[in-house]
């Protein structure tokens, strides 16, 4: 049950950071005028990875992309490949991860098969939200470098866009929606490479093993078997009594800390 | 049809106060900030600030800080601007303006609202 | 606070006459974001508030004339009147729309012969 509810966990959770790096990687505040010292422009200048914004007093905002693809800087192509990648990956493994679900049943799937993608998915999970918290960090540093700006903003030569006044920008919404959605990407993967130990069937030397317990027997055998007790598959080759997930070979012990996902 | 009609000529004394209305018809009052000129005779226009009628958000010219207050009252579609301590250089023509949408402008103004201060 | 300086400070045509008039701002007013420059032309006639003639320093106000047209970057701009009319006697008044404070030209008097 506590393997379940790890793996339901760390979906949830990865589904939430991928969902939130997608939102900031789309979001146009990355980068948005410091106003610390009381507005010194009637307008507001704010950027993101695609395109930089402007808005005025009266509300009007308008928008325009970044219409060239050589003339950007290196450090901002990086930025958006990382979070491109963080999303791909992050996409891929929402993916594999669904099937890999243990509430969810397709066909005949090994209870192997089903850890296996487990600790794909997970490792999945963790690469997306390190990209995500490394795309965020960069421009961030990006921003602090740039933070005394004098005549150019961080974009010169950005398709001609020049800014010829003492424009400093600070970090933007998307920068913290991006440090938290990858964030919690990073647990979500953790949470499924925990419960994948938990999903992995034991590799015994012996063909099968007899006890007694409960006043009943059960036989057990290493692979896809369900036993008799009303659990349904049982993945790990255990039986829970009060909680206490023993193998084969704990069963007259009593549980330990380390019988606990 | 947008219209911004200003209160009447002011004669004051010195060191009073005097505080003007500009009453905005023909568009939605909260939606435009409202502007407030100075036209002193012999001199160009000043800027001495704006109210953004929506929620009381002001933004003053340093010089009038202390001289001039914005306000608004949202149910009479009226803007406000209150002059104290009155001295001859505050004898001007006075406009309340709209600003546009675009550009930061001002596309509407009032028939402004002449104030003298003498003794 | 930006120094907004308009020449000549008067001028005297005569109707059918192209005109122009200048106003150089002690900063750029072109911001990078839009590409935009925040410089915006009134036209002001005796005993009348200031009509809004042109923002962003080459967008015509609608129901302005097509003779009037404004153009110019970052600290030079131009207020043009390809054929000057009777009705075009006024002050007319550039403005910073672009720092705070807003800050106005002296104005150019425009006189007819």
């Known amino acids: 049950m506590a393997v379940t509810a790890c793996q339901g966990l760390g979906f949830v959770v990865s589904l939430i950071g991928i969902a939130g790096i997608i939102a900031a990687t789309c979001m146009d505040q990355w980068s948005t005028q410091d106003l610390y010292n009381n507005p010194v422009t009637a307008v507001f200048n704010y950027q993101g990875l695609w395109r930089s914004c402007v808005r005025e007093s009266s509300g009007f905002t308008e928008c325009r992309g970044y219409f060239t693809l050589l003339g950007l800087p290196a450090m901002l192509q990086a930025v958006r490949a990382l979070m491109i990648v963080g999303i791909v990956l992050g996409a891929i493994g929402l993916l594999v991860s669904i099937f890999a679900l243990k509430c969810i049943r397709i066909g005949s799937m090994e209870d192997s098969a089903k850890a296996n993608m487990t600790l794909t998915s997970g490792i999945m999970f963790i690469v997306s939200g390190l990209c995500a918290i490394a795309g965020v960090s960069v421009f961030a540093n990006m921003l602090v470098t740039n933070f005394w700006m004098s005549t150019a903003n961080m974009y010169t030569g950005m398709g001609g866009m020049v800014q010829t006044v003492q424009t400093r920008y600070t970090f933007g919404a998307a920068l913290f929606v991006g440090w938290v959605a990858g964030g919690l990407t990073l647990i979500g993967g953790v949470m499924m490479c925990i419960a994948c130990r938990g999903l992995a069937p034991e590799e015994t030397n012996y063909k099968a093993v007899s006890y007694h317990a409960s006043g009943h027997s059960v036989a057990y055998k290493p692979g896809g078997f369900k036993a008799s007790t009303g659990f349904g598959s049982n993945t790990k080759n255990k039986k829970i009594y009060d909680g206490g997930a023993r193998t084969e070979d704990e069963v007259q012990s009593y549980p330990s800390k380390h019988d606990y996902v | 049809e947008v219209q911004l009609q200003q209160s009447g000529p002011e004669l004051v004394k010195p060191g009073t106060s005097v505080k003007m209305s500009c009453k905005a018809s023909?568009?939605?009052?909260?939606?435009?900030?409202m502007h407030w000129v100075k036209l002193s005779h012999g001199k160009s226009l000043e800027w001495i600030g704006y109210?953004?009628?929506?929620?009381?958000?002001?933004i003053y010219n340093q010089r009038f800080k202390g001289k001039a207050t914005l306000t608004v009252n949202k149910s009479s579609r009226t803007a406000y601007m209150d002059l104290r301590s009155l001295t001859s250089e505050d004898s001007a023509v006075y406009y309340c303006?709209?600003?546009?949408?675009?550009?930061?402008?001002?596309?509407?103004w009032g028939q402004g609202n002449s104030v003298t201060v003498s003794s | 606070d930006i120094v907004m300086t308009q020449s000549p400070s008067s001028l005297t045509v005569t109707p059918g006459e192209r005109v122009t008039m200048s106003c150089k701002s002690s900063?750029?007013?072109?911001?990078?974001?839009?590409?935009?420059?925040?410089l915006t032309w009134y036209q002001q006639k005796p005993g009348q508030p200031p009509k809004l003639l042109i923002y962003?320093?080459?967008t015509r106000e609608s129901g302005v004339p097509d003779r009037f047209a404004g153009s110019g970057s970052g600290t030079d701009f131009t207020l043009t009147i390809s054929r000057v009319q009777a009705e075009d006697l006024s002050f007319y008044y550039c403005q910073n729309s672009y720092f705070y404070p807003f800050t106005f030209g002296s104005g150019t008097k425009l006189d007819l012969r």
């Open positions: 900063q750029s007013l072109l911001n990078g974001g839009n590409q935009r420059n925040y």
């Open positions: 962003w320093a080459s």
């Open positions: 109210i953004n009628p929506n929620n009381g958000g002001t």
């Open positions: 023909g568009y939605t009052f909260t939606d435009y900030n």
């Open positions: 303006a709209r600003q546009g949408y675009y550009g930061n402008s001002m596309d509407y």
